[in-house]
């Protein structure tokens, strides 16, 4: 799986999305979890409804949401109020009985606050990235990595 | 029980090459990306170069770059350090030292050590 | 390459002190730094991951904290088995780099 690096903000809200098969996915509940480094567990933050049905109710768990448009297949994960401690690499997935197929791989970055110059020193301005080699930018706020790319970056 | 069991000390003259293991007990190292660090008499630690063994792929600081060559046999879960060219500066302890990668890994695993001597 | 400087590079305390130990990142480094505990003769431990998280066994006197470029180690109350050289370490990207270590001595 490629990586695909979303960055926030700091204090601010982060919004992630993870394209994926409707068809392959039609009736499986989804999950986002944060992986304890790049070869370890993934941990459970939040998950869709109970309901497949009811996929599209906004679910929360502390200050991250999870909403899946299951017609249209994009899963979306909203992180709330965006901390340096919410860096670091997630997963969303897709679940069939105990198992989970992983959607997409995230890498979250956070941000300093331009107009917050009292942590200025605490947090990372955008500019080149410092995770990835010769990452591909998409947008604004997220970019991939392309196959066979290792994340040259962060530690334990 | 889980852990990093490596070969033993080794006293080499300088020029020659030293391949020093780490065998991993209680774990497959195809999970886990294997580090190479070693710490010089009285210094701190330095970080050599690392292995995922799953992928066979491997990276190194540029220091070490073409002078060190970290590999693993997956079927024997054995990490290993070959040093060339080795010079009296190389004496050292050498640590091989396994984990989850970045990102947060909460695993954490160190051999015993290997001292490695150069000297004429 | 990113370079991690400690301070002190030692110190003297006695059991039951609070001692902290700093360490700054040459570039932003996010929450990326790990706390490392070495004994003379033996492998280094972690205690810290990410900053602030502590790492399993390790006991709750030990604190970590920052982010970006500057971290603190905090030992809350100082016990016997603490005296040890303590290094920091980022792993915001490769080549992973230690700090030059401090070493705690008894006073």
């Known amino acids: 799986h490629n990586t695909t690096v979303f960055q926030g903000v700091a204090g601010q809200s982060l919004q992630v999305s993870c394209p994926y098969d409707s068809m392959k996915h039609w009736g499986r509940r989804k999950a986002w979890c944060r992986q304890l480094g790049e070869k370890g567990p993934c941990q459970r933050v939040v998950s869709t409804h109970n309901l497949w049905l009811l996929s599209f109710l906004r679910r929360w768990n502390g200050s991250t949401a999870i909403t899946d448009d299951t017609l249209g297949g994009t899963l979306t994960i909203t992180l709330r109020n965006l901390q340096p401690h919410d860096a670091g690499l997630y997963q969303c997935q897709s679940l069939h009985g105990s198992e989970a197929d992983t959607l997409r791989k995230v890498l979250v970055e956070v941000l300093a606050d331009p107009l917050d110059h009292r942590d200025a020193g605490d947090l990372w301005f955008p500019g080149e990235s410092e995770s990835f080699e010769d990452a591909h930018v998409e947008h604004s706020i997220s970019r991939s990595l392309l196959e066979g790319e290792i994340p040259f970056p962060p530690t334990s | 029980q889980v852990q990093l069991v490596q070969s033993g000390a080794e006293v080499k003259k300088p020029g020659a090459s030293v391949k020093v293991s780490c065998k991993a007990s209680?774990?497959?190292?195809?999970?886990?990306?294997i580090h190479w660090v070693r710490q010089a008499p009285g210094q701190g630690l330095e970080w050599m170069g690392w292995?995922?063994?799953?992928?066979?792929?491997?990276k190194y600081a540029p220091k070490f770059q073409g002078r060190a060559t970290i590999t693993a046999d997956t079927s024997t879960s054995t990490a290993y350090m070959e040093l060339s060219s080795l010079r009296s500066e190389d004496t050292a302890v050498y640590y091989c030292?396994?984990?989850?990668?970045?990102?947060?890994?909460?695993?954490?695993?160190w051999g015993q050590g290997t001292l490695v001597t150069v000297s004429s | 390459d990113i370079q991690m400087t400690q301070s002190p590079s030692s110190l003297s305390a006695s059991v039951g002190d609070r001692v902290t130990i700093t360490c700054h990142a040459s570039?932003?480094?996010?929450?990326?730094l790990s706390w490392y505990q070495q004994k003379p003769g033996k492998a280094p431990k972690l205690l810290i991951y990410?900053?602030?998280n502590l790492h399993t066994g390790v006991p709750s006197r030990f604190s970590g904290s920052g982010s970006g470029t500057d971290f603190t180690l905090t030992i809350s109350s100082l016990q016997p088995e603490d005296f040890a050289t303590y290094y920091c370490?980022?792993?915001?990207?490769?080549?992973?780099?230690f700090g030059q270590g401090t070493k705690v001595e008894i006073k």
């Open positions: 030292h396994a984990d989850h990668g970045n990102y947060g890994s909460t695993m954490d695993y």
């Open positions: 209680g774990f497959s190292i195809e999970d886990f990306y």
């Open positions: 292995i995922d063994p799953e992928q066979g792929e491997s």
């Open positions: 570039q932003h480094i996010n929450v990326w």
């Open positions: 990410k900053a602030s």
């Open positions: 370490q980022q792993g915001q990207t490769y080549p992973r780099t």
